[in-house]
Structures are given as C-alpha cells and as structure tokens.
Interface confidence: low
C-alpha cells in the first residue's frame, strides 16, 4: 500500500487531461527536504479574516488582512504547485441561484485559478465526498484547463466529510482557517485564517496531511491500519516545529482529525485543543460557530462533554477567565441554546469563577436572497500562551469521523514590540468581536428569535 | 485601453501557409489567454484554439489541430496563428479575442481576411 | 462536443420592442454561457459573459438569463445601433462552441 510515484514538480501540463474528473494521476509531489532548504526559510505568519458586507466595526479597532486580498496574494506566489484540501467548491454565485454582486470576489479568484493553470503550475484538489455543492461547476471548469480533482469518500470511510480548508503553495506557503472555497467566505460570511509565507518545513507537515487525503480519494481505498512511514509527522505536541517568524521566537505545529487520519506523529485535533486549553492560566477566549456537548450527525446523538468539561475545569479550577462566543444566524440550530446556558450558569464571579457566552449576530439587512451566509463561521481559540486556529466546529463528530486540521501557534513575548504575538493580535480581534454590538449576552435572546438581529 | 490590432486582409495561394499577427496592448499580455476564432462568409463563429503567453500553453479544437499553430511573441505582446497547407476552405475571417473572466472572450481584434486563389 | 443551438437564424422586430433571442446547449453548460454582438461590418463585442453579467460599457437594455441547457438575451428597447448578429458561446467544456447566430433586422 504505497503512495504512487508522481509527476516531477511542474511537469503536468495544464488541459492537457481528460475532460472528466481528474482520478489517476497524482498532484507533483513536495521537493525533497534538502532541496526545500537550499531556499532558506523565512517564516512569515499573517492573520486573515472575512467580515461580511455592511457589517462595520468601530474605526481603528483591529483588524486582520482581508481573505480574498490575502487568497489572491497567496496564488500570485505560485511557481510551481498549489494543493487545496476543501470541503466544497461554490465560488461563482448562479452555482446557488443568487445574483449578487459580491460573489465577484469569488469569480475572480476561480478567474485567477484558471489563469494559474496557464502558466504551467499543477492545481491539486481533494475535495469532500459527500459534498454540499451538488449544483457547483467550479471543477470541472478547473479540470478542463488541467487541474487534478480527486473527491475523497469519507462519508464511506469514516461517515464523515472532508472538513478541512487548507492550501500549500510550492511546498513553501500554507492558508488553514475556517473558510470554504465559496464566494460566500469571501464577502458574506465571517471567517477567520492564518496565511503562512516562506516556511517549507511547516507547509511540507501539512502537505503530509493533504497526501493523506490525495491516497484516499483514488477508486476503492481504504483506510490503512497503519499509515505508511512518509505521512508521518515530525511535528506535534511534544516537538513543535521551533523557528523564527518575522524574527519572533515560535513554535508550531499542525493538529489532524479523526484519529484515523492522524499517522505516527500527527497530534489529534481534540488533544491538541485540550493542551491549549490545559495549558491556559489567565484566559481561554474561543469563537465557534457551533457549539454543541454532543453528537451532531448520529442517531440518537450521545453527550459527549469532553470540550464542555475543559472549559468548566479550567474556570472553576484554575480561575482562567472563560469567554464563548458562539455564531448565530438564520441557519443555527436553537437547540444549542441550553447548552449555552448550561456552561455560563458555571459563572460565579464571587467565587473567581468567570464563563461568559455571548452569540454574534451578523444582521442579515439587504443580503436575505443569500443563502447560509451572515454568520460567524470562525473556529478559533486564544489564550495568553497559544493561539489555534482550526477548520472544525466545536461537537464530537467533528474529531471523531469528519477530516480537519488545527494550527497551534505559540510566540515569546518580550522579543518584540508589545502586541506584536499571534496570541496577541488574535486576542485583540477576539475582544473587538466580544465587545461589539453584534455580541449578544444570552440574557438578550428571546427563545424563538435566538439569531435575528434586534438592531 | 484593450486594443488587439490585426491586419486587415492576406490574399494566399493553395498549398502554402499564412501566420497572421494579433498585437495587444492596454493590459498584461501575458496574463490572459489569447483566442483564435475562424468564420466563413455568411456564417458562425467557430473557435479554434487558445494559448497562455504566460507560458506558451495551448489547446485546440480538434478539428483545426494539424491546420492551425499558435505562437506568442512576449517582448512585443504579439499573439500569432500560422495556417498551413491552405485550401478554399480556410478562406475566411479570423478573428483574435482575449480570454477574460470565466473564459468569456471579453475584447476581440477586427479580424484578417484570409483569401485563398491561386 | 457541445451542440449549440439558436434556432431563429433572423428576427425583425421595430425600434422600441422587447426583444429575446434564445439559445440551446446539447447538455448543461451551468451557466457558462456568453453572448456577442457582431456588427454588419464585422466588429465584434462581448456583452454578457456567465449567463447574466453585463460586460463593462455595454448598455443596461441587454439582459440575459437561463439555466441548465437554456438560455436568453434580452433586448428591453431595440435601438437602432442593435442591429447586429448574436451569438451565444459556451465556456463549460473545451472546445469552446458558438450557436449558428440570430440576425436582427428592423421591420
């Protein structure tokens, strides 16, 4: 059971394969290690985040670097490579029967894709099987120009979906974060990510767990019992990867779910957020869009306390100051609500014991026709040591049968300017989100009317 | 603005080639892909083939593979189609067009009348 | 290869009228469906690109729609600088196909 050798970098030749679904050939595979480091790296790390339209924040608050401006930067860099693990593909607006303005954001960058293609460079897409997408053309157009599409079946292998949302560009650069490749991401929804420049050792961990899917998207595979020794990781938990990022001591790794897809070395999603959680002394500071302390896709569902305990054990035993804040839209399911309830009756300042939950309602104002948009879709987490960002929802499916990754992020403080760390820069866009007026108390929602914005 | 300049008209004999030349200007030429589009007197359109003078890629519509060839010269944005082994059949209009968003061919050349006598 | 069909090869219609041309893929084009504008002197213009986009410059009395295999360019008020052949252009599957063309003449 081997990985089949592929194509020498750059070598595929754009439309220049059947017109169906690429399934047989494989994405060039990474430069060797020593060839990556002949380039030495320099590691770069940018936050970047979508705001839906006509959301406006208060002027200079903080921001993060714009998604699709940081999308469009990330594919200009490519020479030779760019693979996309992703949920779906929906980034022209008539895929959904919507004729709106702001998915031009989208056609421009399914636009910059195409043009990629004619420039010799080899696109790489493992994408979910099942998917939302059923109407989106978005690969095939790809695949008629020459980008290899392979549609990963985890709702057969592990009764999941393919979750992720991540790109490696020339083994060299990384995007991970919340958002999907749809128009949507980019000007309707609230996303947030990490773009990653110059740093061949982190990118070539995660193009690892790309390969992993890459292998389960040909006919009839199956999930090995044990992965084969190429996908495993030399970064995890216990051994970050240490560099300097803009000159800024770091240490990095990246996180995998389920455990079926996590090789030897690979830290599992749920420990790797259980350590930051764990290792928190001051604050825990999360944005989800779901939360849920069960099961979300199996019948009957099962309680599955394992995030809601960590969080309620860090606040009552540690005095770690505990903030949620938990998207809300016309698409949420209400049933989360006690549960939201439940965790914040922990609260008892007198007692040194601080849980706050707080929704963020993204008004739907003139945008109605759209649909599965105006929401708070990020899936990150701060703390004063570590920032992570990740692509999963926070109930158990999520890290037991659907595929995602996590980044966990820790800078020194101290070497440089004040505010300048990860934590840091997510932290301030964590408490610019709580303390907007778009942050909703659950004392302020009336059941029946959780998500609609009161204006 | 986007101009793409084309001659207005080549008279050839049966038998031999003709490269006709589309320069462009009033963007990046090497960022989109050129089109070549043929129409017979008194009739449709009909594509065929493109190139990426980012990096000389192409296709082609089947039917034009062994006639048409398609070349760019970066230095002078200048798209090139020779055709070969001319018959009555290729006396036509052929047309130059750059491949804008989603493929649409969003600026065309005038086109260079092909006249094949002897 | 994807047949495009335009089945009315000319249409007369007076300045002022609402005017539709149709257009027929052999299969689903989803929408990557493009409509030109080519004059009597042989000048040729893009004017709606991806079923419904107007392409810069051109004038909002155009309009297209459809879906699946089935599509339309709507003229809302026929001017006289209309008078031109359309084309319709499918950009799903290589190669690229073009409909035979509706010419549009004033009554």
């Known amino acids: 059971w081997q990985v089949p050798r592929p194509p020498t970098w750059g070598q595929v030749q754009p439309k220049d394969v059947p017109r169906s679904w690429e399934h047989g050939s494989s994405p060039a595979w990474e430069p060797l290690e020593a060839e990556a480091r002949q380039q030495r790296d320099s590691c770069q790390l940018v936050l970047v985040e979508s705001i839906p339209q006509d959301l406006p924040s208060a002027a200079g608050s903080p921001s993060a670097q714009p998604l699709g401006q940081a999308w469009l930067q990330l594919l200009d860099t490519a020479q030779e490579s760019v693979h996309v693990a992703s949920y779906y593909w929906s980034l022209t607006g008539p895929d959904i029967g919507v004729n709106d303005s702001s998915s031009q954001l989208g056609e421009a960058l399914l636009q910059k894709l195409q043009q990629l293609l004619g420039r010799n460079i080899s696109l790489a897409v493992a994408t979910s099987s099942p998917t939302l997408a059923r109407t989106s053309t978005d690969l095939q157009v790809l695949a008629a120009r020459g980008a290899h599409v392979r549609q990963v079946p985890m709702g057969r292998l592990t009764r999941g979906v393919l979750h992720s949302k991540f790109w490696v560009v020339d083994g060299r650069h990384i995007y991970m974060g919340s958002a999907n490749m749809d128009w949507r991401s980019l000007t309707q929804v609230k996303e947030l990510g990490a773009v990653i420049y110059n740093c061949s050792h982190l990118a070539q961990d995660l193009e690892k767990t790309f390969q992993t899917y890459w292998v389960l998207g040909v006919p009839k595979a199956v999930l090995p019992k044990t992965w084969p020794q190429n996908f495993s990781s030399h970064f995890n938990r216990f051994q970050p990867f240490h560099g300097l990022f803009d000159g800024v001591p770091t240490t990095a790794y990246f996180s995998a779910s389920p455990p079926a897809l996590c090789p030897q070395g690979r830290t599992r999603d749920l420990e790797a957020l259980l350590a930051v959680m764990g290792s928190a002394q001051e604050f825990i500071y999360a944005s989800v869009m779901e939360y849920f302390p069960t099961t979300r896709f199996s019948h009957p569902p099962r309680y599955w306390p394992v995030l809601d305990n960590a969080l309620r054990a860090a606040a009552f035993g540690k005095g770690v100051r505990v903030r949620l804040l938990v998207g809300c839209g016309l698409n949420t399911d209400p049933t989360m609500f006690p549960y939201l309830r439940s965790l914040q009756a922990l609260s008892n300042p007198a007692a040194n014991v601080s849980v706050d939950v707080k929704v963020f309602i993204v008004p739907v104002g003139n945008h109605s026709n759209i649909p599965f948009s105006r929401v708070n879709h990020s899936k990150f987490m701060v703390t004063e040591k570590a920032a992570y960002i990740g692509t999963s929802n926070w109930s158990e499916d999520y890290f037991s049968s659907t595929a995602g990754v996590g980044l966990v992020v820790t800078q020194s403080p101290g070497a440089q300017p004040a505010g300048a760390t990860v934590q840091e820069q997510l932290r301030q866009l964590f408490e610019r989100d709580w303390s907007s007026r778009y942050a909703v108390g659950l004392d302020g929602q009336a059941p029946g009317q959780d998500c609609v914005w009161q204006g | 603005q986007v101009q793409l300049q084309q001659p207005g008209a080549e008279l050839v004999k049966p038998g031999t080639s003709v490269k006709m030349s589309c320069k462009a200007s009033g963007y990046t030429f090497t960022s989109y892909w050129m089109h070549w589009v043929k129409q017979r007197p008194g009739q449709g359109l009909e594509w065929i083939g493109d190139i990426y003078p980012g990096s000389d890629s192409t296709n082609y519509n089947e039917k034009f593979k062994s006639k048409a060839t398609l070349t760019v010269d970066t230095s002078s944005s200048t798209a090139y189609m020779q055709l070969s082994s001319l018959t009555s059949e290729d006396s036509a209009v052929y047309y130059c067009a750059r491949g804008g968003w989603l493929d649409a061919m969003d600026y065309w050349g005038q086109g260079t009348s092909v006249t094949v006598s002897s | 290869d994807i047949q495009m069909t335009q089945t009315t090869s000319s249409l007369s219609a007076s300045l002022g009228d609402r005017v539709t041309i149709s257009c027929r893929a052999s299969q689903d084009i989803s929408n990557y469906l493009n409509w030109y504008q080519q004059k009597p002197d042989g000048t040729v213009k893009l004017l709606i690109y991806y079923t419904s986009r107007l392409h810069s410059g051109v004038p909002s009395r155009f309009s297209g729609s459809g879906s699946g295999t089935d599509y339309s360019l709507t003229i809302s008020n026929l001017e006289q600088e209309d008078i031109a052949t359309y084309f319709c252009?499918?950009?799903?599957?290589?190669?690229?196909?073009f409909g035979g063309g509706t010419k549009l003449e004033i009554k």
């Open positions: 252009q499918q950009g799903n599957t290589l190669p690229w196909t």
